[in-house]
């Protein structure tokens, strides 16, 4: 048996790459990152690794914009090989491709510890709100590749990783306020092995490395000739990027768990979360910080700050991996949610096809793990318990009837949130 690769391809940031194709990733707000090489592997996954630069044996090595590694002047490529890239114009100033600069006044609610980092890449200006690390010195200095000031001697995190590190595109570009946060750190990919990889499609624009996440949030905004405004929403002094969700914080009530707001370009849309009518246990309990009641599980020894124990249990209940795949074409969305179980060893795939908000088709398939491993596009999104899965399937049965006769926009997305197990507050389940 053989997988024919002529039709296999990788999707990365909405672009198709053939198997074996190599490229530099386009990471906002930096533009093309020449110090990272990506390759489309045979199974449709994208593997990216940092370029290792050889030691240069000359006194004044030269940096060339489209090359990662510094070169000695005598080994420079001829001038006619020069890569010509479009420059950008912003606020009356012309910037060259790859040039970084700071902009003012783009984000109305910029926090004091944030700055606006912009870059010119292929004629487009990409700007992001960057949260700067706390400074521990009295006289910070400016550095060329960041809008944040740093203490002298501190190297910017920038793209530094240990040599040759392979990094992955997060399954969710979790900015600080994302509702979709899974408090279980999933393994880098479904496949066994030490390499973290980009699993196929559903790529989010602006892949940030894990170390980059630690230095603060970057909210991507694109500025082109059509719109000079930031595609962000501001709620309660916090900035959210398009597509991000959060619970509103109302002065009189605090955080309202039963309302979920989503940033749609620049306006926020909020809706009430509907809890299941029935639970798989007799006495569901209300927990601080959660909208819906949950079924109490047997007490588990908790790891510090987590409700998962080291065997993959959550509040005493075994957890199972949940995968998701979303495919959109011609106004039709096919959403697949898959649960992997050990007993029996299988993957249950729930397939939803929605056109213009109306459910066209819904069915469930039970396939072997081996068959599932052949499938592209599925991303591990969280781990869940059997009781949460039961709530999900009951809710699914209800909305599959409801959404076949009326328009449903976010019902399935909201239902999927049932599967996310949140870190328990104050250490109780």
């Amino acid at each position: 048996e053989q997988v024919k690769h002529s039709e296999t391809y990788c999707m990365f940031q909405d672009k198709k790459y053939r198997v074996g194709e190599r490229w530099h990733p386009y990471l906002e707000p930096y533009g093309l990152v020449y110090c990272v090489n990506c390759i489309c592997s045979e199974n449709g996954n994208v593997l990216c690794s940092r370029v290792r630069c050889p030691n240069v044996h000359c006194l004044s090595p030269v940096h060339i914009p489209h090359l990662c590694c510094p070169r000695c002047p005598d080994s420079l490529p001829p001038v006619n090989n020069k890569v010509t890239s479009k420059s950008c114009e912003y606020n009356g100033t012309t910037y060259q491709h790859g040039e970084l600069f700071v902009a003012e006044g783009l984000f109305q609610n910029r926090q004091p510890n944030q700055c606006t980092q912009c870059s010119c890449s292929e004629g487009n200006v990409y700007c992001g709100l960057k949260t700067c690390p706390k400074l521990t010195c009295a006289f910070p200095v400016s550095v060329p590749d960041s809008c944040c000031r740093v203490c002298r001697g501190d190297g910017e995190l920038s793209w530094e990783h240990s040599d040759g590190d392979i990094f992955r595109q997060p399954a969710n570009r979790e900015a600080r306020h994302s509702y979709h946060r899974s408090h279980y750190d999933p393994p880098p990919s479904r496949q066994a092995g030490g390499l973290s990889r980009f699993p196929g499609a559903r790529s989010h624009r602006g892949a940030l490395m894990d170390s980059q996440q630690a230095s603060g949030t970057i909210v991507q905004i694109v500025i082109n000739n059509k719109h000079k405004h930031g595609q962000v929403c501001v709620s309660n002094g916090k900035t959210y990027s398009h597509g991000e969700s959060w619970h509103p914080n109302l002065r009189a009530f605090g955080i309202v768990e039963c309302v979920l707001c989503t940033c749609n370009v620049t306006k926020q849309e909020c809706k009430k979360i509907h809890c299941p009518n029935r639970y798989p246990c007799k006495y569901p309990q209300k927990i601080d910080g959660k909208c819906c009641k949950v079924c109490p599980g047997k007490k588990a020894k908790e790891l510090p700050g987590q409700s998962f124990d080291n065997k993959g249990y959550f509040c005493g209940e075994e957890t199972m991996p949940v995968y998701e795949s979303v495919f959109m074409e011609d106004g039709e969305t096919t959403r697949k949610i898959a649960l992997e179980t050990e007993r029996p060893p299988q993957v249950e795939v729930h397939v939803w096809t929605i056109r213009k908000g109306i459910l066209q088709h819904f069915h469930i398939e039970k396939i072997s793990k081996r068959m599932f491993e052949e499938l592209p596009h599925f991303k591990l999104v969280t781990r869940t318990t059997l009781s949460q899965w039961k709530i999900f399937t009951e809710g699914e049965a209800q909305i599959s009837q409801m959404c076949s006769s009326r328009v449903c926009r976010t019902e399935l997305e909201d239902l999927v949130k049932v599967l996310y197990l949140e870190r328990s507050e104050k250490g109780h389940c």
């Epitope: 449709g44 029996p344 299988q346 081996r370 499938l375």
Partner: antibody, heavy 122, light 107 residues
């Protein structure tokens, strides 16, 4: 009603080529994985090739006996499945069935066409 | 590849009798097994999938059982239209392979 109608079979010489077609109707063709299964005269069934749907990158899979010689493809806009057979051998002589998967990923064969006969002979 | 071994290769039975055909997999395929019926000069038809789930329109006299490596198809009270060849097939992974078949003939 699900219908699969194969065509394109016939007599061909060894090392020759042939392209089989299958016209599908009665179901949402673009969402299902499709297969070709063959049966040599008086013999058992042998799976030949599979093509997944667009949402699975049109991934293709082949039996060892046909790899590098046969190519499975599909045209969702026309609800058509194809099997391009090159460098044919006498052992490729068989009835070729166009088959619809039981689901998106199942790999059990829910619906079969009536078959088209391919004879490879000098 | 997973090998599927079917037995018996052929069997004779009379209308009204009960027959059992068995299928063995070369490795654990859990419940990922399908059964097909093929009448002379016709295309195969799905009878059972996931070892024991009856396909739409299949009479209840057919039943599938087993898991792991050992499976069987039982036909209660044979009817004249039940005579023909029967094939098992695993749907555990790629490539899906078939058993060599069992020819059920009228005694």
């Amino acid at each position: 009603e699900v219908q699969l109608v194969e065509s394109g079979g016939g007599l061909v010489q060894p090392k020759g080529s042939l392209k089989l077609s299958c016209a599908a109707s009665g179901f949402t063709f673009n969402t299902y994985a499709m297969h070709w299964v063959r049966q040599a005269p008086g013999k058992g069934l042998e799976w030949v090739a599979r093509i997944r749907s667009k949402s699975s990158n049109y991934a293709t899979y082949y039996a060892d006996s046909v790899k590098d010689r046969f190519t499975i493809s599909r045209d969702d806009s026309q609800s058509m499945l194809y099997l391009q057979m090159n460098n044919l051998k006498t052992e490729d002589t068989a009835m070729y069935y166009c088959v619809r998967d039981g689901g998106y990923y199942e790999a059990w064969f829910a619906y079969w066409g009536q078959g088209t006969l391919v004879t490879v002979s000098a | 590849d997973i090998q599927m071994t079917q037995s018996p290769a052929s069997l004779s039975a009379s209308v009204g009798e009960t027959v059992t055909i068995t299928c063995r997999a070369s490795e654990n395929i859990y419940s990922y097994l399908a059964w097909y019926q093929q009448k002379q000069g016709k295309s195969p038809q799905l009878l059972v999938y996931h070892a024991k789930t009856l396909a739409e329109g299949v009479p209840s006299r057919f039943s599938g059982s087993g898991s792991g490596t050992q499976f069987s198809l039982k036909i209660n009270s044979l009817q004249p239209e039940d005579f023909g060849s029967y094939y098992c097939q695993h749907h555990y992974g790629t490539p899906p392979t078939f058993g060599a078949g069992t020819k059920l003939e009228l005694k």
